[in-house]
């Protein structure tokens, strides 16, 4: 017994005075606790505990189940213990078959012995199967067999405690090891959609999927910058042993504009945390916003092609789209398609393909689009650049030479005089009068210019050139003059195209 200083309380003394006692099944167990302040005896084995207020613990006919630790405690809380083995050849093990192990931790197979005097107290695989090569265990006849550093691969491992008796293995009841995995990575979280656009009154529902090795992963939906508890519904599945999936669905049955914001699905385990967000935008009504991809004023050369392209945002989705020119709707030459195949896409593209445009095809081209809530339109003013065309070239009764030309942009008319038979007309002649006339055609059509010069200024035979030009090209008309005495005659005018 331990020695103590006088005056200090000492632990009780037990008879027999040894740490371990082995008795045969059927024999008497008689334990005496001597202490002036005796309180109680306590018996413990596996999860069982019994108490006795008598200072002498007597079990008349010992059974294997009386194997365990007997502890005497005094009023000072000091105690002393003796471990009793009740040797029963018919019951070598006491067993608690529940066996859970946390990955990377040790776990106890609870099969204490009723007789410590045995050989090869070990673990064995069921049905003669070998144990995993890396499995190590520490035997303790009073507690059981400790498996060291449980691995995930040991999950559902079937085991027996075993001893050798007379050359044969005696096995306990079987144990099935259930391994609780350790978290070695953060949870994997994903959301059904990254953004939602709704009208007031519509239902908002979003699902977060959380994946981890076990169901003890924590997850919640949170509204950013808010502490309000959100209503969630859960579904969960175990896909195999260490593949757990939870779906957390957040629902707002009738969304309001002030429900707009960022919602976060947050998950954490002992390794760390992860989150994913989704954005909700609630609008009081639908909308359409159109964005021209080219300038809405378009200049194109005669005979060339042009594509009128718009992008537009439409929510709810567009129901009717059309391109119109001069109150006529195009049935072909245009296409309309979503900007992306994303489920939450609200952006679309519409393209009108105008090919080999003629001078008469300038004007306003309008794109119209509508959905169940709104209509919207955008207009393109298309100007077709045309080379000047000389409409008339005449000598008037008042002696004026007049040239009328049409084209776009507005043509400029220059006059030149070529003396004699020279082909090159270089001497310019200033016009007497220049006017831009109102075209009788549609707007965006050709512009008509009239220019006049006084023919009395010419005293010699020669040719007068009227040259009309703009950015696109030029065209000329010629007046030939011959003098007979004092009379001037106009020989038939003619035009000459100059590229």
């Amino acid at each position: 017994q331990p020695s103590v200083s006088p005056g200090e309380p000492s632990p009780p003394s037990i008879h027999p005075g040894k740490s371990d006692l082995i008795v045969r099944v059927g024999d008497e167990i008689r334990l005496l606790c001597t202490d002036p302040g005796f309180v109680k005896w306590t018996f413990e084995i596996l999860d069982e505990t019994n108490e006795n207020k008598q200072n002498e613990w007597i079990t008349e006919k010992a059974e294997a189940t009386n194997t365990g630790k007997y502890t005497c405690t005094n009023k000072h809380g000091l105690s002393n213990s003796i471990y009793v083995f009740v040797r029963d050849p018919a019951k070598l093990f006491l067993v608690d078959r529940s066996l859970y192990g946390k990955e990377d931790n040790d776990t106890l197979v609870r099969c204490p012995l009723t007789d410590p005097e045995v050989t090869n107290y070990s673990l064995k695989g069921c049905q003669g199967k070998p144990l995993p090569k890396d499995l190590r265990f520490i035997p303790d006849p009073k507690a059981g067999i400790m498996i060291k550093s449980v691995k995930r691969a040991y999950h559902r491992l079937c085991l027996h405690c075993s001893v050798d008796q007379e050359g044969k293995s005696v096995l306990s009841e079987k144990f099935i090891l259930k391994v609780r995995p350790a978290f070695k990575a953060v949870p994997v979280v994903s959301v059904s959609k990254a953004s939602y656009l709704l009208r007031e009154g519509e239902e908002f529902t979003v699902t977060c999927t959380i994946k981890d090795v076990s169901s003890s992963v924590y997850s919640t939906w949170k509204r950013e910058n808010s502490q309000t508890k959100l209503q969630e519904k859960y579904n969960s599945w175990h896909h195999g042993d260490f593949n757990y999936e939870r779906q957390a669905t957040l629902t707002i049955s009738s969304a309001r504009v002030n429900d707009s914001g960022v919602f976060m699905c947050y998950a954490n385990n002992t390794f760390g945390s992860a989150n994913v967000t989704t954005t909700l935008e609630v609008v009081d009504k639908g909308f359409i916003n159109i964005f021209p991809m080219i300038n809405t004023t378009v200049f194109v050369n005669d005979g060339e092609n042009v594509d009128l392209i718009v992008e537009y945002e439409a929510f709810p989705k567009p129901e009717h789209q059309q391109w119109i020119y001069m109150n006529r709707t195009f049935t072909d030459k245009w296409e309309d398609y979503p900007k992306s195949e994303n489920e939450s896409n609200i952006r679309y593209v519409s393209e009108l393909h105008l090919t080999r445009l003629k001078g008469t095809e300038g004007g306003t081209y309008t794109f119209l689009v509508s959905n169940s809530d709104v209509n919207a339109a955008i207009a393109f003013n298309v100007y077709v650049n045309t080379k000047p065309e000389i409409l008339t070239y005449d000598r008037l009764v008042n002696g004026m030479l007049q040239c009328v030309a049409a084209g776009f942009p507005e043509p400029t008319i220059d006059w030149y005089f070529c003396p004699g038979t020279e082909q090159r007309c270089s001497a310019s002649v200033l016009p007497v009068d220049v006017q831009t006339l109102n075209s009788s055609g549609p707007p965006f059509g050709k512009l008509v210019v009239q220019s006049s010069i006084d023919s009395s200024a010419f005293k010699h035979n020669g040719t007068v050139e009227c040259k009309a030009y703009n950015d696109v090209g030029k065209t000329s008309a010629y007046f030939n003059f011959a003098f007979k005495g004092n009379n001037k005659e106009q020989i038939h005018p003619h035009t000459l195209f100059t590229p």
């Epitope: 371990d20 144990l131 190590r136």
Partner: nanobody, 128 residues
Framework: QVQLVESGGGLVQAGGSLRLSCVAS????????MGWFRQGPGKEREFAAA????????YYADSVKGRFTISRDNAKDTVYLQMNSLKPEDTANYYC?????????????????????WGQGTQVTVSS
């Protein structure tokens, strides 16, 4: 620190007996599991026998079961290996081992990685 010193090795005829002793010093002997490993010529070291700190629970390799007996005397800080019916294949250097928490693997084999202290060894030669 625990020091382990083996003795009792020697030359013996096949079928004969030897008793090996291992004396421990330096720490509480009774807290340690004790055992014997052996290494034959050109072979790896292998487990032979072990006894837990309670002095009652023993372990034997299949190759020595029924022929060898391990025991300990905590009062003398000594562990013994009684070897009977010796065979030429028992020829080896026999090493005493001590571990505070001995780890075993399948078949009740003491995993030598969990040995805390080793002796220098004693030679046993069994002639045919």
């Amino acid at each position: 620190q625990v020091q382990l010193v083996e003795s009792g090795g020697g030359l013996v005829q096949a079928g004969g007996s030897l008793r090996l002793s291992c004396v421990a010093s330096g720490r509480t002997f009774s807290s340690y599991a004790m055992g014997w490993f052996r290494q034959g010529p050109g072979k790896e070291r292998e487990f032979a026998a072990a006894i837990l700190s309670n002095g009652l629970t023993t372990y034997y390799a299949d190759s020595v079961k029924g022929r060898f007996t391990i025991s300990r005397d905590n009062a003398k800080d000594t562990v013994y290996l009684q070897m009977n019916s010796l065979k030429p294949e028992d020829t080896a250097n026999y090493y005493c081992a001590a571990a505070f928490t001995p780890e075993f693997r399948d078949g009740g084999i003491w995993d030598d990685a969990s040995v805390d202290y080793w002796g220098q060894g004693t030679q046993v030669t069994v002639s045919s």
